[in-house]
């Protein structure tokens, strides 16, 4: 190449289809056979073109016809007389992709093709999108300004046409504006939340456009608050409504996860409250939904759980009634005797002594949810409840001996049953049989029997003398025996007996004593009179 001819242009030019680009270019040629008034002609050719016969894609030579496919799109904007070969390519098309070179003509000597120093034009698919600048959250009723910018601008290139579409805009949309950016002002309404706003950028060639769609976020108070429940790590479900407040039953020990989510803009602060105690809360930017974990639910976890969602525009809350179900616990019997209001707790297997004729109230008590079904049995027989409304209460207004035995309270429950038994022993004061006496060869033989609970003790009195064991003079002999509630005692009197002496049998236990007397008569064959005293 002639060292006096040089050109400076980028080796490769890339332009998206349909867009415009300016290709800066400068060149130099020798000052030979031309003057200042000699016209300088510049030509840009596709590399496939023969410069003598073919048409250039652009030239400043008015009488030279240009390539039909580039006419009106390629323009030599530089002044070749000043060494400027800059080229503008508008509405770039795939068919423009090629190698291009520049030719200069000035006077008779300067007629030069810069064959090996042109540029390659690559036409790419239009993938660039405009940038839309919009506040993250829009306030309903407050005017907002949105800016759309298409970052592709070159001198000599016409600006694209901008237009906006979206449900938030008035039905006729907006008038297209021609610039390198577009400013849109509108007043968002609550119903515009989650609607699309699109900025369209249209270029000169039909069908070549770029667009960017943004989703409007208009602020609103929390709504659509949803509570869902996950049990034992199963997927979350919504609780079943019961009345106005959803109701949830859980078994003691179960793993429960209560989830709360609300739709709001800006994001709401979520909190879980039990009664008036805040159990957990989330920041607006925290994870959604807000979970409350109850790893092993206890009876004490029952209650009304309220999820509250709150942002600067308002709040919403929903409640959930949790009932923790568990089988009977701490089953026991409370006892009230003889109208005493003091209740004593009795556990399983307790023996309960009660005085015959007294009143007795047995109250079976347990904790369970839902309440267990209570019933009383005696010796396997179901007893009718004293108060049908409260089958755990068993009333015995007058305790009889036949009441003695085992009483069992049964607590029946879907999650498990329990029972507690107590042994009722009926106490009473002694009942005396005897004494009765008869003469035998050795002397007088008397017997005395008594029934009582607890078992009675028997003793003999002769006059004022208590007869215990055997006398040293072998004048009497006492033989006791007992079986269950019965006590028996035999007395043998030897030797002479003073007439008029009173023989007395006495039976006693903690609840009282009873005695019977025999008044002796002198006649051995005669009757013996007996008198009883308590």
């Amino acid at each position: 190449m002639d060292g006096r001819f040089w050109i400076r242009v980028q080796e490769s030019v890339m332009v998206p289809e349909g867009l415009c680009i300016s290709v800066p270019c400068s060149f130099s040629y020798p000052r030979q056979d031309w003057t200042g008034s000699t016209p300088a002609y510049g030509y840009w050719f596709k590399a496939v073109t023969e410069t003598t016969k073919g048409a250039p894609v652009a030239t400043n030579h008015q009488s030279r016809e240009v390539e039909m496919s580039t006419r009106g799109r390629f323009q030599l904007t530089g002044d070749p007389a000043k060494g400027n070969c800059s080229l503008v390519i508008r509405d770039a098309q795939m068919q423009d992709e090629s190698q291009y070179f520049f030719r200069v003509e000035r006077g008779s000597y300067v007629r030069y093709n810069f064959m090996n120093d042109g540029f390659f034009l690559k036409v790419t698919a239009l993938t660039q999108k405009p940038d839309v600048y919009i506040p993250e959250t829009l306030e309903p009723g407050q005017p907002v300004t949105v800016i759309c910018v298409f970052n592709w601008a070159f001198e000599e290139c016409p600006p694209p046409s901008f237009s906006w579409t979206g449900a938030a805009l008035s039905s006729q949309g907006t008038k297209p504006t021609t610039s390198h950016f577009s400013v849109l002002s509108f007043t968002p309404r609550p119903q515009d939340h989650n609607t699309d706003l699109t900025c369209h950028v249209d270029f000169s060639r039909k069908g070549v456009s770029a667009q960017r769609t943004v989703r409007l976020r208009v602020a609103y108070a929390p709504r659509d608050l949803v509570i869902s429940i996950s049990r034992d790590n199963t997927p979350a479900l919504e609780p079943q409504p019961q009345g106005n407040v959803p109701y949830l039953e859980a078994q003691k020990g179960q793993f429960l996860r209560l989830l709360c989510a609300a739709d709001s803009q800006p994001p709401a602060t979520l909190s879980w409250v039990l009664q008036n105690r805040v159990l957990s809360s989330s920041h607006p930017w925290g994870p959604r939904p807000l979970g409350l974990e109850l790893p092993g639910v206890k009876a004490g976890d029952s209650g009304r759980y309220t999820c509250r969602a709150e942002n600067r525009l308002g709040s919403q809350q929903r409640a959930l009634d949790l009932s923790v179900q568990y089988p009977p616990e701490n089953l026991r019997v409370m006892v009230s005797q003889a109208n005493r209001t003091v209740l004593e707790n009795l556990g399983n297997g307790t023996s309960l002594p009660v005085l015959e004729g007294q009143s007795l109230c047995l109250v079976c008590v347990t904790h369970s949810s839902p309440p267990a079904r209570l019933s009383w049995t005696q010796r396997g027989q179901v007893l009718s409840p004293s108060q049908p409304s409260d089958p755990g209460v068993l009333e015995l207004p007058r305790v009889q001996v036949e009441h003695e035995g085992e009483f069992t309270c049964h607590a029946r429950h879907p999650l498990g049953s329990q029972h507690v038994s107590l042994s009722l022993s009926v106490h009473y004061s002694p009942k005396l049989l005897g004494p009765s006496c008869s003469w035998e060869a050795e002397g007088l033989h008397c017997s005395c029997s008594s029934q009582a609970s607890p078992a009675p003790s028997l003793r003999w009195w002769l006059g004022e003398e208590l007869l215990e064991g055997n006398s040293s003079q072998d004048s009497f002999e006492v033989t006791p025996s007992s079986a269950g509630p019965w006590a028996n005692s035999s007395l043998s009197l030897h030797g002479g007996l003073s007439s008029g002496l009173r023989l007395r049998c006495e039976a006693w236990n903690v609840h009282g004593a009873q005695s019977g007397s025999i008044l002796q008569l002198p006649d051995k064959k005669g009757l013996i009179s007996t008198a009883f005293s308590n």
């Epitope: 289809e17 596709k46 068919q95 090629s98 190698q99």
Partner: antibody, heavy 120, light 107 residues
Framework: QVTLKESGPALVKPTQTLTLTCTFS??????????LSWIRQPPGKALEWLAH???????RYNPSLKSRLTISKDTSKNQVVLTMTNMDPVDTATYYC????????????WGAGTTVTVSS | DIVMTQSPATLSVSPGERATLSCKAS??????VAWYQQKPGQAPRLLIY???NRYTGVPARFSGSGSGTEFTLTISSLQSEDFAVYFC?????????FGGGTKVEIK
């Protein structure tokens, strides 16, 4: 003198991946504006453009086959490779490696082509 | 995709006669059309580009015309070596597409 030569298997089984190599001479694929395309022609049918690779490793694919095609180049070996996955009997064709005149999208230099049959 | 439709599918012409081949584009492609000749067992050969520009070394009896959607390849006087299949191609937009071809046979 510019020459292009295609090579690859004559027979591939359905679902297999086809790998074709175009070895060229007479120019460098590192020169600005250079690029090579692959075009195929089923027996007795029309030509179909598949893919193109530029000197700067930019690539173009026919959208209808894009998910199955990969074009790559090894400038030092003067080679361009086309891989086509999940071959089907309808992909039976002669595959040509071609060069555009001065980087244009019409093709002045064609390889002789390599015939690929897809059959089990 | 732009569809290129060639007609007729087969053209029977006597040597020395004129042959006119038609190619229609499904949408405006400007002048971004090329024509190729293909003989049996050979690769296609470029004849015309930019609708009407004859490629280097192509005989003058081959000429192209048209713009927009309708294009014509004319062979003014058929020689024996011209009996072949001719394809048109558009390069106005991706993907590049070819016509189905016109077979020119000896009458």
């Amino acid at each position: 003198q510019v020459t292009l030569k295609e090579s690859g298997p004559a027979l591939v089984k359905p679902t297999q991946t086809l790998t074709l190599t175009c070895t060229f001479s007479g120019f460098s694929l590192s020169t600005s504006g250079m690029g090579l395309s692959w075009i195929r022609q089923p027996p007795g049918k029309a030509l179909e453009w598949l893919a193109h690779i530029y000197w700067d490793d930019d690539k173009r694919y026919n959208p209808s086959l894009k998910s199955r095609l990969t074009i790559s180049k090894d400038t030092s070996k003067n080679q361009v490779v086309l891989t086509m996955t999940n071959m089907d009997p309808v992909d039976t064709a002669t595959y040509y490696c071609v060069r555009g005149l001065y980087g244009n999208w019409f093709f002045d230099v064609w390889g002789a082509g390599t015939t690929v049959t897809v059959s089990s | 995709d732009i569809v290129m439709t060639q007609s007729p599918a087969t053209l029977s012409v006597s040597p020395g006669e004129r042959a006119t081949l038609s190619c229609k584009a499904s949408q405006n492609v400007g002048t971004a059309v090329a024509w190729y000749q293909q003989k049996p067992g050979q690769a296609p050969r470029l004849l015309i580009y930019s609708a009407s520009n004859r490629y280097t070394g192509v005989p003058a009896r081959f000429s192209g015309s048209g713009s927009g959607t309708e294009f014509t390849l004319t062979i003014s006087s058929l020689q024996s070596e011209d009996f072949a299949v001719y394809f048109c191609q558009q390069y106005s937009s991706y993907p590049l597409t070819f016509g189905g071809g016109t077979k020119v046979e000896i009458k």
